[in-house]
């Protein structure tokens, strides 16, 4: 069955969406699963149907019960079910976990909680935030657009928030409030802007023709385990798979962590056979992650023989 | 610039499959490393997996074993098959390009509209 939990506090504006999906021109009618009674679109009504919302303005515990909606389309039905609890405002500060929505973790570096369900609302910021039912103040929180950012994350920050928003319809403000738990991973690893070690910037390298040659293209990207971290080897703006020259190839090296815990990768280009035309190459290495890209350039020079004359 | 159009996504019921394409226009595509990220409603864009040449491509843990990332030249276009799809893999999922310039920033990236994926029964 296409169904979904949804769940709200008495008094607070509550909307659901239909949990099947249908183009905005589809109709979609909507109706009381226990008496089959169908849901007014009249927006007088407290509780009301929008295409594919169903509002509760405000919310009641008797609303409480499973509703269909049915998404009609010139050629076919489809049917879902929206189960809705609407709970009595606890007298204490304890939120029970029936009312909690999922669980976030954060860390040092990334410290955002998003206040749950507000897509669904004609909400204006800002967002007021609340932990553990205090008002967060001072400048570590900031409020931004539909999340919560905390500056210097640090165990203590872990427990519940919550926060509160105004829905506006037809220029009536109800209150919603939403919460979920915060955990904080002990993460000492980071990203950061790729970090090319070698090859210098416009490097020039000296060959020797008929020899073999290695470029290596080594780079840095943070601390710690990498979500995603590249380095490849380019032949004129063209990748190295695709250049079509057998005998020049990348080979993957050693993935470096060294003792300051920087998370490195190298990648060897190796060309065989140096020969004149490789000269005239442009050779791009570019170390990708999600931070985005770096590119350094290199250039072939042919080294002079050494003269040996005494 | 490249402008790229991904199609491919739709309803699908858990355990199910969908091929997702990104079509990228202009003659960029050989020196361009390819990716897919995704954003579910109230989340963050994430990363699910880049394709750096024909050999290298890297996936975020949660899609690993499952989704597999591949190019054509030929075709200029980057594909994204999902397997065993989940009810969390739902979400709009974007083709992103990177290529060109001395230094990129995620930013900077050229992204496509998205494409929704809904993985329900």
């Known amino acids: 069955k296409f169904s979904k939990q949804s769940w709200g506090l008495e008094n607070e504006a509550l909307i659901v969406r239909c949990p099947r999906q249908g183009k905005p021109s589809y109709t979609v009618d909507w109706y009381y699963s226990q008496t089959n009674k169908s849901i007014p679109t009249q927006e007088r009504n407290r509780v009301f149907a929008s295409g594919q919302l169903l509002k509760f303005l405000p919310a009641a515990v008797a609303d409480s019960g499973i509703y269909t909606c049915i998404v009609r389309s010139p050629t076919f039905n489809r049917t879902g079910y929206a189960n809705v609890t609407i709970y009595k405002k606890q007298s204490d500060c304890n939120v029970p976990d029936y009312l909690m929505y999922s669980t976030v973790s954060g860390s040092e570096k990334n410290s955002k909680i998003y206040c749950p369900t507000i897509d669904l609302y004609n909400w204006t910021a800002p967002l007021e935030w609340f932990k553990n039912c205090q008002a967060l103040q001072g400048s570590r929180y900031r409020a931004h657009k539909s999340f919560l950012v905390i500056d210097n994350v640090m165990t203590e920050d872990a427990g519940d928030y919550t926060c509160k928003f105004i829905h506006n319809e037809n220029g009536a403000n109800y209150s919603v409030t939403a919460t979920r738990s915060f955990t904080v991973k002990d993460e000492q690893g980071f990203s950061l802007f790729p970090v090319i070690g070698a090859p210098a910037q416009n490097e020039i390298k000296e060959v020797e023709i008929g020899k073999n040659a290695n470029l290596t293209c080594s780079a840095c990207f943070g601390k710690g385990t990498q979500f995603l971290a590249a380095v490849l080897w380019q032949l004129n703006g063209t990748k190295i798979t695709d250049f079509g020259e057998p005998r020049i190839q990348q080979e993957e090296g050693q993935n470096q962590s060294f003792s300051n815990g920087l998370a490195c990768l190298d990648m060897v280009l190796r060309i065989a056979d140096v020969k004149e035309e490789d000269l005239l190459l442009q050779y791009d290495c570019l170390a990708l992650n999600l931070h985005g890209l770096r590119r350094h350039t290199v250039r072939l020079s042919r080294k002079n023989p050494i003269d040996h004359h005494s | 610039e490249v402008q790229l159009v991904e199609s491919g996504g739709g309803l699908v019921q858990p355990g199910g499959s969908l091929r997702l394409s990104c079509a990228a226009s202009?003659?960029?595509?050989?020196?361009?490393?390819m990716g897919w990220f995704r954003q579910a409603p109230g989340k963050e864009r994430e990363f699910v997996a880049v394709?750096?040449?024909?050999?290298?491509?890297k996936y975020a843990d949660s899609v690993k074993g499952r989704f597999t990332i591949s190019a054509d030249n030929s075709k200029n276009t980057a594909y994204l098959q999902m397997n065993s799809l989940k009810p969390e893999d739902t979400a709009v999922y974007y083709c992103?390009?990177?290529?060109?310039?001395?230094?990129?920033?995620?930013?900077?990236?050229?992204w496509g509209q998205g494409t929704l994926v809904t993985v329900s029964s």
């Open positions: 394709i750096i040449d024909s050999r290298t491509t």
């Open positions: 992103a390009a990177v290529g060109g310039a001395t230094t990129v920033t995620a930013s900077e990236w050229d």
């Open positions: 202009g003659n960029a595509f050989r020196s361009t490393v």
